[in-house]
């Protein structure tokens, strides 16, 4: 029951996380124009991975895509790639995990197959979450670098001419959505991996039994030695027959010429 709950919760958490990664990737507010000390108030600019938007003082908003590929920074391309890889891995992970769910029966699929699928989807979710977190962090680092470079230019300028007052950008909402979503996907993946351990069928445990023959007249009763699966009636390692057989716990330590191990 706990395994099913862990697996189900892991799936739901990952699903929310991947939905968040998709939302963050599509959002336009990855960076927003820093308004502090900016003399230009007629326009407010915010930018995403795919397009830039301007909201004018009149209330009119217009967005334009970055139609050039070569003119864009390599870091932006890297962030795009990381987010897309995260989405693709997450989507495949979701597909695999649906079939791996313990509460869903598909033909005669064995528990070992479900365990492997759960582990696979868990690893995919972990990598997906890491991709999203990495992508968002790289973008955030790019913004911080750009911000301080712009601030430096603001106060030094080139030849006494201040160059970039209006080019400072700060963290947009998409960064926080991406961080949280990546974290959720990662947590969901870890939960799936934990659930996998519980799903794997238990190995048959043959309990060691020592036989103590008390006399030559002891008759061996076939079928007395049973494999314990943890589900049978002999879960406490009780005596199965009386013919001198003892469990390890019950064996006596006094020496005898008839002792056989």
């Amino acid at each position: 029951m706990a395994v099913t709950a862990c697996q189900g919760l892991g799936f739901v958490v990952s699903l929310i996380g991947i939905a968040g990664i998709i939302a963050a990737t599509c959002m336009d507010q990855w960076s927003t124009q820093d308004l502090y000390n900016n003399p230009v108030t007629a326009v407010f600019n915010y930018q995403g991975l795919w397009r830039s938007c301007v909201r004018e003082s009149s209330g009119f908003t217009e967005c334009r895509g970055y139609f050039t590929l070569l003119g864009l920074p390599a870091m932006l391309q890297a962030v795009r790639a990381l987010m897309i890889v995260g989405i693709v891995l997450g989507a495949i992970g979701l597909l695999v995990s649906i079939f791996a769910l313990k509460c869903i029966r598909i033909g005669s699929m064995e528990d070992s197959a479900k365990a492997n699928m759960t582990l696979t989807s868990g690893i995919m979710f972990i990598v997906s979450g890491l991709c999203a977190i990495a992508g968002v962090s790289v973008f955030a680092n790019m913004l911080v670098t750009n911000f301080w470079m712009s601030t430096a230019n603001m106060y030094t300028g080139m030849g006494g001419m201040v160059q970039t007052v209006q080019t400072r950008y700060t963290f947009g909402a998409a960064l926080f959505v991406g961080w949280v979503a990546g974290g959720l996907t990662l947590i969901g993946g870890v939960m799936m991996c934990i659930a996998c351990r519980g799903l794997a069928p238990e190995e048959t445990n043959y309990k060691a039994v020592s036989y103590h023959a008390s006399g030559h007249s002891v008759a061996y009763k076939p079928g007395g030695f049973k494999a314990s699966t943890g589900f049978g009636s002999n879960t406490k390692n009780k005596k199965i027959y009386d013919g001198g057989a003892r469990t390890e716990d019950e064996v006596q330590s006094y020496p005898s010429k008839h002792d056989y191990v």
Epitope: S31, Q47, E56, F60, T164, T167
Partner: nanobody, 118 residues
Framework: EVQLVESGGGLVQPGGSLRLSCAAS????????MGWWRQAPGSQRELVAI???????QYGDSVKGRFTISRDNAKNTVYLQMASLKPEDTAVYYC????????????WGQGTQVTVSL
């Protein structure tokens, strides 16, 4: 690369008028503003006026009611009509194009001198 060519500066008497123009050549990202900034000797750069690609206009506090900015999007040109000029308007006037492509870009003209004096 975007190139800006300014013209129209010169010497004018107080109360007089002057018209500055700035033509931008090259590929400019669709979301942008074109405008004018000025810098007097020993002073910080100051916003004069800007005109956005969407039609919004903003003036600096010191020139409101006296200066008029206009923009011809087809020609990628911005004009600044200056009237009722005062001696304190004396400065180097710089044309600026700011594009809102990824993390923004600034392009500046070489500047044109405007002197208001008797």
């Amino acid at each position: 690369e975007v190139q800006l060519v300014e013209s129209g500066g010169g010497l004018v008497q107080p109360g007089g008028s002057l018209r500055l123009s700035c033509a931008a050549s090259g590929s400019i990202f669709g979301l942008n503003f074109m405008g004018w900034w000025r810098q007097a000797p020993g002073s910080q750069r100051e916003l004069v006026a800007i005109a956005t690609s969407g039609g919004s206009i903003q003036y600096g506090d010191s020139v409101k009611g006296r200066f008029t900015i206009s923009r011809d999007n087809a020609k990628n040109t911005v004009y600044l009509q200056m009237a009722s000029l005062k001696p304190e308007d004396t400065a180097v006037y710089y044309c600026n194009v700011h594009t809102y492509d990824f993390l923004g870009r600034d392009y500046w003209g070489q500047g044109t001198q405007v002197t208001v004096s008797l």
